[in-house]
Interface confidence: medium
């Protein structure tokens, strides 16, 4: 019979013959012959292959380097790579998460608009009129100025974007 020019899914053509690919998690040891099946072997510890393949070597799992602020989010298997993420307080510098940088803190006069995640930095916003922040924080929002009126007090010192208003007793002397 005519030798095949194309093979079915999960097969590959070699020496005019269709051989089965190795399943995910296994590597190729030897191609099939007229008389034998494809020979595959499982990937070793800390190795993986994530597709049907004819690779003779498995890929090494990614190393989550703690010196770069990385930790393991999901341990690799023989069929999947290790997924790294950043330690708490840090976020990835790229989609591949090859290294991490420290979350930014919002300085006094600025509040947190959006708390950082493992992949995005803190978003700070200036405290608008009527609000203040006197801390350097990766978590704290701008706080509203104290309402002196609701305490039956008057403003003795105006607030700023970094300081609260200072309330004091009402002047009882009236003309």
């Amino acid at each position: 019979p005519e030798p095949p020019t194309a093979c079915r899914e999960k097969q590959y053509l070699i020496n005019s013959q269709c051989c089965s690919l190795c399943q995910p998690g296994q590597k190729l040891v030897s191609d099939c012959t007229e008389f034998t099946e494809t020979e595959c072997l499982p990937c070793g510890e800390s190795e993986f292959l994530d597709t049907w393949n004819r690779e003779t070597h498995c890929h090494q799992h990614k190393y989550c380097d703690p010196n770069l602020g990385l930790r393991v989010q999901q341990k690799g298997t023989s069929e999947t790579d290790t997924i790294c993420t950043c330690e708490e307080g840090w976020h990835c510098t790229s989609e591949a998460c090859e290294s991490c940088v420290l979350h930014r803190s919002c300085s006094p006069g600025f509040g947190v608009k959006q708390i950082a995640t493992g992949v995005s930095d803190t978003i700070c916003e200036p405290c608008p009129v009527g609000f203040f922040s006197n801390v350097s924080s990766a978590f704290e929002k701008c706080h509203p100025w104290t309402s002196c009126e609701t305490k039956d007090l008057v403003v003795q010192q105006a607030g700023t974007n970094k300081t609260d208003v200072v309330c004091g007793p009402q002047d009882r002397l009236r003309a």
Partner: nanobody
Framework: EVQLLESGGGLVQPGGSLRLSCAAS????????MRWVRQAPGKGLEWVST????????YYADSVKGRFTISRDNSKNTLYLQMNSLRAEDTAVYYC???????????WGQGTLVTVSS
Amino acid sequence: EVQLLESGGGLVQPGGSLRLSCAASGFTFWVYDMRWVRQAPGKGLEWVSTISATGVHTYYADSVKGRFTISRDNSKNTLYLQMNSLRAEDTAVYYCAKYPPAGRFDYWGQGTLVTVSS
């Protein structure tokens, strides 16, 4: 100069409790977020918990959630870690750290050793 002095560690049986303290000086304590990290024997640093400057926001590692409580007293410049239902795997040297550091966890005290063993 930033100084952090941890205390309150010791030997405790599994299921027991301890309260760690961290006395801070050399910086305006109430302005900064603070955190606890720990280092088990032969292991790397592990983040435990973070508290925001005013104490409104608290965050915990999954391994301690529901058992540990972080708090602070800004009038006393002191950070606390209440540790309940302690397990053998909580054995470590515990450090408090200012956030953000100039580098990675760069302001250290001498740490306080917590040993959980029967």
